[in-house]
Interface confidence: low
Amino acid sequence: NQDLPVIKCVLINHKNNDSSVGKSSSYPMVSESPEDLGCALRPQSSGTVYEAAAVEVDVSASITLQVLVDAPGNISCLWVFKHSSLNCQPHFDLQNRGVVSMVILKMTETQAGEYLLFIQSEATNYTILFTVSIRNTLLYTLRRPYFRKMENQDALVCISESVPEPIVEWVLCDSQGESCKEESPAVVKKEEKVLHELFGTDIRCCARNELGRECTRLFTIDLNQTPQTTLPQLFLKVGEPLWIRCKAVHVNHGFGLTWELENKALEEGNYFEMSTYSTNRTMIRILFAFVSSVARNDTGYYTCSSSKHPSQSALVTIVEKGFINATNSSEDYEIDQYEEFCFSVRFKAYPQIRCTWTFSRKSFPCEQKGLDNGYSISKFCNHKHQPGEYIFHAENDDAQFTKMFTLNIRRKPQVLAEASASQASCFSDGYPLPSWTWKKCSDKSPNCTEEITEGVWNRKANRKVFGQWVSSSTLNMSEAIKGFLVKCCAYNSLGTSCETILLNSPGPFPFIQDN
């Protein structure tokens, strides 16, 4: 075993949009830090066989299996997968190690299995075995976290029933509004399930696993804040737990808080109170209203009252099934080439939606912003002034929603021409869709003012890729115009563009752009 080479097997995960990943099994640029797969000698096997740790890959992920060989002299190699041999091109790195790579692009079920690499060096022959399988994400779930009171303690537990087990964190913020965004310095994150500090302004719990991240905000009424113009609304599904926090600050402890549902006091055991003195010696009280599993009759106006503050209410609506409310009628917009413009969709939804914006089969991330009136809004501004169809798609556990937008960019026509033995055609994608004129250039009309009306056929066609309209005009050739120059002009309210075509000339047709 003295002569055996030192072998290292690694897995490189590529980001899906990484254009550095090659199409062949030659060495691609590394886009993620390599993961060591071990490569231990397999005992009791005939010949020298190394086995790498099993590799689990997400569907559509791109990976590279790579072997680094520390052995003197040249090496030759061969990959075998499902009884087919695959090309293998070793090269040497800066430390003079032999490097052999196998790139798997956009992993599918058919690419799962055993990959055998046979290596022949000057000293010895050996085999390396990789087992690649697709990660079974069908069993994966990521559920929105919910709150429970910790037994015998004034603390909340954050629970997310997800597979694989998620990492749970509390996201706390003590300032108002915009400064409570995730990246803000005012935000503190605690990676733990139990939270004792329940007096903060904004409290959220988030759970994350391989499927992403889901958060739930502790719904709060702050009696020291000016009430919103519209009543805050909280939606829950039957069976979910209800948690509402009422918070108030006063100069001393001489005040109390109470919860009422539709003017009736909440039952004992459905609330608990906490209080503390703040740094400036004022008293902060919070009163939680909670129902461990809501039913339809828990719907109503929940009012928090104080002996020293005006009371405030929230409307709690219990629904059987989630929903997405928005108008799904398609919308058409027309803008100038440099005009700032964003598509926007205003919606009310529960549970929170996942959404995407799509243009020309490419998806873009979708951001949502909550509005004061219980609605949310998603805007898309990254259209780069490309005309066509834009699609907003949203879904949650129970509902789906799609809305179509068409963007038209106002611009002067640009004309392209082509000709054959029997006809000449001109195309334009200016907007508004242009009108066409054809003119004949002759001795009598050197400025090409003689209009052609016979044999002209205009049409508009949808360029399917972008949902963008293109207008075309075709002139069928007649004896009267053979051998002449003709001019096709497209015009709209922004201008005119023309092309001149020599009909029936030998060889390629000359086109003269004429603006």
Epitope: T327, S329, E331, D332, E334, T406, N408, R410, P432, L433
Partner: nanobody, 111 residues
Framework: QVQLQESGGGLVQAGGSLRLSCSAS????????IDWYRQAPGKQREWVAQ???????HYEPSLKGRFTISRDNAKNTAYLQMNSLKPEDTAVYYC?????WGQGTQVTVSS
């Protein structure tokens, strides 16, 4: 789907005035440009005027000064005020939003 309906056309003597209206159904009216076009008998349709979503106006140079375009977003309606009309203004007048056109309204100016 946007639907447009022009009105206000008619027979008028040279030097007279008319006010054309273009009423629209559909939610995207206020967000979009409105164009007026006209088509005289035996001639191509020609652009007349435009008002942007922000209320800026543009005119065919030869008509500027005589024609005024305006809009009332609350009523989903655009207007074309035509003064000092000439016989050569005789045409069917159309309004357009995006790729939607009205049926047109006939304006006839007699000398």
């Amino acid at each position: 789907q946007v639907q447009l309906q022009e009105s206000g056309g008619g027979l008028v003597q040279a030097g007279g005035s008319l006010r054309l209206s273009c009423s629209a159904s559909g939610s995207t009216f206020s967000r979009n440009y409105i164009d007026w076009y006209r088509q005289a008998p035996g001639k191509q349709r020609e652009w007349v005027a435009q008002i942007t979503s922000g209320g800026n106006t543009h005119y065919e140079p030869s008509l500027k000064g005589r024609f005024t375009i305006s809009r009332d977003n609350a009523k989903n309606t655009a207007y074309l005020q035509m003064n000092s009309l000439k016989p050569e203004d005789t045409a069917v007048y159309y309004c357009r939003i995006l790729d939607y056109w009205g049926q047109g309204t006939q304006v006839t100016v007699s000398s």
